[in-house]
Each structure stands twice: as structure tokens, then as C-alpha cells.
């Protein structure tokens, strides 16, 4: 029988009345245009909604916008457009919400053609009040907050100036001209690239990378011949043009650009690209595009310095620069990532890793599913997940995979069961163990969200027709109840719940199908009365993550340690609550070869845990470039996986000797760098 229709599915008692009492409709006095929604702060209940409406006139488009504010998680909204003097707000800049709980908001206004500069509206009290500020420049990008100090803002102007404010946008100073890209680093540092000759495009590959640690009083050039740069975790990456040809290489710094090392990654040509797929303080996943217009490349995983890389996954699907990749960090379980590969026959298959890229495998076929037409063998096939690429290809996939750090083990995604991703209408699948096993959760495409740290899952069917029904589950997607939240169906445009999945409120957004005027409408449903009581100790059960063989003493060991979690029993209908903290008990494991990556010059043959020398390097001294010096590596082929905490057990030898020789391949050594003060 279909999910949710089993006899053992216990119904939540009297849920219709409970939800009806907690369903709040708000019709916006607005013609349908576009709507954007932002949460201001964490657990504040404050939501800002900006509606914009463009009326096509004969020679131009007339725009108007309205700003609404809720302070009760979307149950009620107040029109606060007058606080911004009824000004038209530019949606392409969005609402710039300050970090953490700063309560800061910046809105960028549309100004008339001949004006000297742009205009912003600033709030530092969770949008209760706004101050209008006229800018001495026209912004090209949204205001960017320093992660460390929300009073510090930076923006690029349409004339490529880098502007900084130290008092939350009250006063602005142009600290540099001819800037292409600027990013905040740690400790209020700003990194930016500059061009010398014509423009950012013309100088691509000849840009300079600069740093200021004092908001523009002084500068240091930390890189030349730069193509682009990026920040990930504690790593600063720059792709740098080679001296002799048009190829580029990645260089890495872990000290804000003072010293650089060349990453042991393949160089790329003009039509290729590098992409940081994921990064944390331990390591980085780097995609290196294949030559030619193949649509795939190779994933490499780094060591703890971001320098030595191991090949992690071949034929990784990534269409073009800034294109689509399905690479997804499963945030509900440590070490788990999902992505797609392009097979030799051009079909797309999903792969999963449970050990941070150490090894990849297909997703296990859900027990309650049949193999589809793509499967050669009807008894052997895998689950394939639809993500960004499928969405970009306009397949019937309304949402990317979903996981939340505080909903341990839960992953929800659209997928198909076969030998490859299917273009047929997908179903929704759920894993409750971080991707090891899967179950079909809902028939057909749906929007979905996680509430109360996994205590409730909410879904809405994806349909081109107006809808008025929401589905919810209190047992991690096994059984579903349906609730008709409005008599008059609406064209559904999105589900909104507070980021972090701790809330019990869900807002359903859409617009009315009307004989008069179509209007924006939101229905906010509070599930607090469905989960009547707070969860107690008896509602939780112990769960060992990454468990595949309970008989094995090392069962659950991933990256050198295992973790036991307290997880809500599926049968318990209770509130985890806003203050819920994931309870986990880690224990260190003995080291095995699985805790080591293959070192520079070594690789792991398929289905083998041993690292063997790359044939082309056999018998050669292993030398590589580090901090501008040449190093000699003595290794038996292994290095510990970044973040791996294992102790004892297997302990391969690894030693690095400084050869005291300069690297000719390195693009910058410390003495070449120059500083400059304003």
C-alpha cells in the first residue's frame, strides 16, 4: 500500500479542529507581482515581506513595492511601506539582513536616472524603524555585512569602486577604484581583485588580489596574475595564470594571503574552471573541470592544509562555470555528501559518500519501490536523486534535497529508482539514517519542509492547479494526514518556515485565483497543538550513526570516531521545542587504513583500502611546493583524513623534509609582496 495508508498508521486525534484554530490567513492588499520574504534574526518571529509589481507602460515599466512586517512568525502582517516613504525597492538587491541577531536590515531603493547616487533604507531594530540614506555612489551589488561586525558594510559601485561604511551605512568612503570582486574574510579583513588596464573582463587573468585589514587605511597586494579567488573554511584560494601559457592553477593560503602554496591539482585551460564545492576548517572539496565541453570533471579532497589533494570522484556532473552541480552536503549526518556523475552512456547517476569523499557508492534501492524502465535488471537498481541539475532542466522537481543539522539522520529528496535518473515524474523519498537506507515517502513531486527539529514534516503537492491541502507527518514520513487549510484554493508559490527547522509554524504562500484581482495571500499554520506535550526522556531512543554491522566492534566508526545520538521515537507525538539541542555521545575509534587518504603520488585502486604508487611517479623523489619552498615527502602512501580523530591501531609513516630550495612554480613568495598605505 502507498505510504501513509498502512493500517498501523495512527491518526493524530482531532487535528482538524486544532489546526483550524491555528491557521491564520493574511491577504495582502497587493496585485500579484513578485514577493520576497526574509527572516530578521533568530527566534524573533520577525518576517519582512517585500512585494513588487511592474506595470508595463508603452515605453517603460512602472514599478511599485510594498513592505510588510510580521512579529509573530507570519500570522499577522502590518503594511510598513510608509516607513520607507513609499519608495520602490529594487528586488535584485533583495533585503540585506544583518548577521546573527543584529536586527539590521538594508533595503536598496530605485532612484531616478539622473541622481548622483543610490538610496538605502536602514534599520537596526528589526525593521521597526528605518532611516533613509542617500549614497554617494550607485550600488552594483547588495550591501555585504562583515561577519564579525554588522556595523561594517561593503558594496561595489556601478563604476567599480569599492565602498566601505563603518557606521552601518550612515557614511560611506570609497577605499579603492577598479575593483572586480570583494569579499569579507575573517577579522574584518576585505579581499578584493583589481584591474589595471581596461576592465574586469579584459584583465581576467591579469588581476591583482589585494587585502586590507583596517577597512581601507592600508593595503597589501597578495597576488598577481589572478583569474579569480574564493574563500572556503579557513582557506583562501586564488586561481592564477601560468607564466608560459593560458592555463591556470589553484594556489592556497591559510594565513590570509601572506604565504601561498600551489595546490597539487591539475591546471585548467581557458574554457575550464575550478569550483569549491564545500569547505570547512578541516578540508575542501574541489571540482576540477575536464577539458572540452564535457559537462563533468573530477572531485578532489584536500588535506588539512588545502595543498595535497586526493582524487575523490571521477566524471562528476558540473555543467559549466557557474552552472549546475548536484553536489549536496547532507547536514543531518557528519561526513555525508550526495552528488551526480555523468556515465559513459550520458545517463546521470547519483553517488553518496559517508566518509567525506573517501569512497562513493550508489544509493541503496528503497525497499518499497520497483526498478523503473531505466533498469536493465528489474531486481537490481539504485535510488537516484534529483537536485539542482534536474531543476535547471525543468524536470518536474520543485525542490532540491533537504536536510537539517538538528533533524539528525533525516534526508528528503525527489528521486527515481533505476539505473539512472529518469525524466519521468519523480516521487519523494526519505532517509532516516543519513542516506544509508531510503523509503518512498510521497507519490509524485511535492514541496516539503522540516519543523520542530524533525518532529513534524510538512508537504504540499506540486501542481499547476490551485491547491488548498497540506500534508503533515509526525513520524518522519511514515504516515501522513491531510488538512484543508482554505476553502478557496490558491496558486501555491512557496513554503516558508524559519531557518533552522526549530519552528512549529509554516507559512504557505500563493496568490488567489479570482474573478476580481489576483492577490498575494499567506496562510500560517502553527502545529503547536498537534504536538501537545513536551518530549520527555522516554520519547527518545539511542541511535548509533553510520551503523552498518552491529556485530563489528568498529561499527559506526567514520572519520575516526563514532557517535550515538538520542533521537525522537517515531511513535512519539511531542514537541522537541525551540531550545532542543541534539544530544550526542562521541567515542574514539582505532585507526585503520580507512582513516587515511592516499598521499601525494599515491592512489587507491577501486575496492581496495590500500594506497599504491602512481605508476608515472614510481621511483621518483616526491617533491612538492609548500609556502614557496620545495619539500621532499617521505611517505608510505597515507595521510590522515582531515578531521579524523582516530587513535592507535594502524599508523603509517609520513615525513616531510624541507629541501631549502625555492619553488620556481610558485607565483608569489613573501618577499615579492608589497604593501601600500592610503
Amino acid at each position: 500500500s502507498a505510504p501513509g495508508e498502512d493500517e498501523e498508521c495512527g491518526r493524530v486525534r482531532d487535528f482538524v479542529a486544532k489546526l483550524a484554530n491555528n491557521t491564520h490567513q493574511h491577504v495582502f492588499d497587493d496585485l500579484r507581482g513578485s514577493v520576497s520574504l526574509s527572516w530578521v534574526g533568530d527566534s524573533t518571529g520577525v518576517i519582512l515581506v517585500l512585494t513588487t509589481f511592474h506595470v508595463p507602460l508603452v515605453i517603460m515599466t512602472f514599478g511599485q513595492s510594498k513592505l510588510y512586517r510580521s512579529e509573530d512568525y507570519g500570522k499577522n502582517f502590518k503594511d510598513i511601506t510608509d516607513l520607507i516613504n513609499n519608495t520602490f525597492i529594487r528586488t535584485e538587491f533583495g533585503m540585506a539582513i544583518g548577521p546573527e541577531n543584529s536586527g539590521k536590515v538594508v533595503l536598496t531603493a530605485e532612484v531616478s536616472g539622473g541622481s548622483r547616487g543610490g538610496r538605502i533604507f536602514r534599520s537596526s531594530d528589526f525593521a521597526k524603524n528605518f532611516v533613509q540614506t542617500d549614497l554617494p555612489f550607485h550600488p552594483l551589488t547588495q550591501m555585504m555585512y562583515s561577519p564579525q561586525n554588522s556595523d561594517y558594510l561593503l558594496a561595489l559601485s556601478t563604476e567599480n569602486g569599492l565602498w566601505v561604511s563603518k557606521n552601518f551605512g550612515g557614511k560611506w568612503e570609497e577605499i579603492h577604484k577598479a575593483v572586480c570582486l570583494a569579499k569579507w574574510g575573517s577579522d574584518n579583513t576585505i579581499f578584493f581583485t583589481t584591474y589595471a588596464n581596461g576592465s574586469c573582463k579584459a584583465d581576467l587573468g591579469a588581476l591583482e588580489l589585494w587585502r586590507t585589514s583596517d577597512l581601507g587605511k592600508s593595503f597589501k597586494t597578495i597576488g598577481v596574475k589572478i583569474y579569480s579567488f574564493g574563500l572556503g573554511g579557513r582557506f583562501l584560494f586564488a586561481s592564477v595564470m601560468a607564466d608560459k601559457d593560458t592555463t591556470r592553477r589553484i594556489h592556497v593560503s591559510t594565513d590570509q594571503g601572506d604565504t601561498w602554496s600551489m595546490a597539487q591539482l591539475p591546471s585548467v585551460g581557458q574554457e575550464q574552471f575550478y569550483s569549491i564545492l564545500a569547505a570547512n576548517d578541516d578540508m575542501v572539496f574541489m571540482h576540477v573541470d575536464e577539458p572540452g565541453d564535457t559537462g563533468f570533471g573530477t572531485i578532489f579532497t584536500s588535506d588539512d592544509r588545502g595543498i595535497v589533494y586526493s582524487k575523490s570522484l571521477d566524471r562528476h556532473l558540473y555543467t559549466t562555470t557557474g552552472g549546475e552541480t548536484d553536489f549536496t552536503n547532507v547536514t543531518s549526518l557528519r561526513g555525508v555528501y550526495i552528488t551526480s556523475v555523468l556515465s559513459e552512456d550520458n545517463s546521470i547517476q547519483t553517488m553518496i559518500t559517508f566518509d567525506q569523499g573517501g569512497r562513493w557508492t550508489h544509493l541503496r534501492k528503497p525497499e518499497n519501490s520497483e526498478c523503473d524502465a531505466t533498469a536493465k535488471n528489474k531486481n537490481e537498481c539504485s535510488l537516484h536523486i534529483h537536485a539542482s541539475y534536474s531543476i535547471s532542466q525543468k524536470l518536474n522537481v520543485p525542490m532540491a534535497p533537504l536536510s537539517e543539522p538538528n533533524a539528525v539522520g533525516i534526508v528528503i529528496a525527489h528521486g527515481s529508482v533505476g539505473d539512472a535518473i529518469s525524466v519521468m515524474v519523480p516521487d519523494v523519498y526519505i532517509s532516516d539514517d543519513g542516506g544509508y537506507s531510503w523509503t518512498k515517502m510521497l507519490e509524485g513531486p511535492h514541496y516539503y519542509t522540516i519543523l520542530d527539529s524533525g518532529g513534524i514534516i510538512v508537504a504540499i503537492e506540486h501542481s499547476s492547479r490551485p491547491i488548498n491541502v497540506i500534508k503533515f507527518s509526525t513520524d518522519e514520513g511514515q504516515c501522513w494526514q491531510t488538512y484543508t487549510f482554505t476553502r478557496d484554493p490558491i496558486y501555491f508559490t512557496g513554503l516558508a518556515s524559519e531557518p533552522g527547522a526549530r519552528s512549529m509554524n509554516i507559512s504557505i504562500w500563493g496568490f488567489t485565483e479570482s474573478f476580481l484581482t489576483s492577490q498575494w495571500v499567506s496562510y500560517t499554520i502553527d502545529f503547536k497543538d498537534i504536538l501537545e506535550r513536551n518530549c520527555e526522556e522516554k520519547d527518545y531512543t539511542i541511535w548509533l550513526a553510520h551503523s552498518t554491522d552491529p556485530e563489528d566492534y568498529e561499527d559506526g566508526c567514520i572519520l575516526g570516531y563514532k557517535e550515538q545520538f538520542l533521537r525522537l521515537r517515531k511513535s512519539s507525538v511531542c514537541q522537541n521545542g525551540r531550545d532542543y539541542v541534539v544530544t550526542k555521545q562521541p567515542s574514539i575509534c582505532l585507526c585503520s587504513l580507512e582513516d587515511f587518504l592516499c598521499d601525494f603520488g599515491y592512489y587507491r585502486p577501486e575496492n581496495d583500502s590500500k594506497c599504491v604508487e602512481q605508476p608515472e611517479l614510481k621511483g621518483h623523489d616526491l617533491e612538492f611546493c609548500l609556502y614557496g619552498r620545495e619539500e621532499h615527502l617521505t611517505t608510505n602512501g597515507y595521510r590522515k583524513i582531515p578531521g579524523d580523530k582516530c587513535q592507535g591501531g594502524v599508523n603509517p609513516v609520513r615525513e616531510v623534509k624541507d629541501l631549502k630550495k625555492k619553488c620556481t612554480s610558485n607565483f608569489l613568495s613573501p618577499e615579492k609582496q608589497n604593501s601600500k598605505s592610503n
Epitope: L31, R32, G33, F53, H54, V55, P56, L57, V58, R465, P466, Y491, T512, E513, S514, F515, L516, T517, S518
Partner: antibody, heavy 117, light 112 residues
């Protein structure tokens, strides 16, 4: 500026069929409900058909139900009225109208339909 | 069907003088959503009808404020404080609360 231009009116025999069109411009067509209203030769106004913003819902008075069909193509910004089984009492000028917070906010200039043997 | 009865059928006025037209419905026009869907339209000679007032008393954009609409339930009135030449034509009331939507027979405003 809201602009509604009707076309397709003609002289037709009783029992015959006709399709009227209304091309809309100067506003976002897909947001608004639309109606056809006819004015009879004795200058009385009669509402004939109505369609919701997305084209999901339609309404008709009993006098035309089953004979007239209102439709819209939001991609083409066009409203239609398919008329069949026409009777002499269907004679009149057919106006396309746009709604807003209430009915019949804007009117087209009309197209003349004459049902006569 | 809701019958809309307009009086008078013809109103002869002098430019600069006030004018008043009444419209009565056979049922209350108060909708369940709290709104009353009563419109007033003007059709000038040789032109299409044009809406002047909606929801009993709201003036459409560009309509001079010498026009006012009032009433509730089943009784509604359109007033012109000082008639001008451009106000001449046929005035229709119409209701949109109940299907089918219905119109009054019209009141012709003409010069004395």
C-alpha cells in the same frame, strides 16, 4: 494605459457560431478576472460571461449557459468568447471588460454581433 | 436574479445644479466578505460605458470629486454636486454580489 480591443463580431444566421476575441495591453493580464458584457439594441446592459485570473473558473447567466464559452490565453494576453446556437436575442454590441477590486473597471469599445436570417 | 431598479429613468438638469439618481436592489448587496459590490457606470453618447464608482462609494481614478456614491443594503444613491456638460449620458448601477451580475435599466441625464 489599459487598452481592450474586441474583434470577431459579424452578421450570423440563427443557430450559427462565432468567436470573439479581446486583445489586452497596458496591464498584467494574468492578474485580473475578465468579463464579456453585451449591450442590446434597446441599450440594456447584460453580463454574458466571466473568467477568473488564471482561467480556472468561469461563470455564465442561465440565458447563455451551454451555448457560450469564455476562455483566455494569458501568454497571448487575449480573452475569447465562443458562441454557438446563436439566437436573435443575442444580438448586440459585445464589450470585453476587466475587473479589479470590483467588476467592470475597464471596457473595450465593443464589437457588433447581429443574429438574423 | 437580483433586480436593480433605477429612478428616475430620465433626469433633466441644468448645468451647475446638483443631481441625484437612486438605485434599489431586490436583495441586500452586502457580501459575506463584508464588501458591498455596487457600481455606477456612465455611458456618454457614442462611447462605451465607463465605471465611475465601485464598492458603493469609491471613486475610480480620474473621476471628479463632484461625484459621490452612498447607501447600503438595498438602497443606493449617486449624487453629482454640480452637473457639467461632460456628465451627460446614461447612468447605470450594477451589482456584483450575487450571480448573475445584473444592471439597472439606466437613467438618462439630459439638459433641461
Amino acid at each position: 494605459e489599459v487598452h481592450l480591443v474586441e474583434s470577431g463580431g459579424d452578421l450570423v444566421n440563427p443557430g450559427g457560431s462565432l468567436k470573439l476575441s479581446c486583445e489586452a495591453s497596458g496591464f498584467i493580464f494574468s492578474i485580473y478576472g475578465m468579463s464579456w458584457v453585451r449591450q442590446t439594441p434597446d441599450k440594456r446592459l447584460e453580463w454574458v460571461a466571466m473568467i477568473s485570473s488564471g482561467g480556472i473558473y468561469t461563470q455564465y447567466p442561465d440565458s447563455v449557459k451551454g451555448r457560450f464559452t469564455i476562455s483566455r490565453d494569458n501568454a497571448k494576453n487575449t480573452l475569447y468568447l465562443q458562441m454557438s446556437g446563436l439566437k436573435s436575442e443575442d444580438t448586440g454590441t459585445y464589450h470585453c471588460t476587466r475587473h479589479d477590486d470590483s467588476w467592470f473597471a475597464y471596457w473595450g469599445q465593443g464589437t457588433l454581433v447581429t443574429v438574423s436570417a | 436574479d437580483v433586480v436593480m431598479t433605477q429612478t428616475p429613468l430620465t433626469l433633466s438638469v441644468t448645468i451647475g445644479q446638483p443631481a441625484s439618481i437612486s438605485c434599489k436592489s431586490s436583495q441586500s448587496l452586502l457580501d459575506s466578505n463584508g464588501k458591498t459590490y455596487l457600481n455606477w457606470l456612465l455611458q456618454r453618447p457614442g462611447q462605451s460605458p465607463k465605471r465611475l464608482i465601485y464598492l458603493v462609494s469609491k471613486l475610480d481614478s480620474g473621476v471628479p470629486d463632484r461625484f459621490t456614491g452612498s447607501g447600503s443594503g438595498t438602497d443606493f444613491t449617486l449624487r453629482i454636486s454640480r452637473v457639467e456638460a461632460e456628465d451627460l449620458g446614461v447612468y447605470y448601477c450594477c451589482q456584483g454580489t450575487h450571480f448573475p451580475l445584473t444592471f439597472g435599466a439606466g437613467t438618462k441625464l439630459e439638459l433641461k
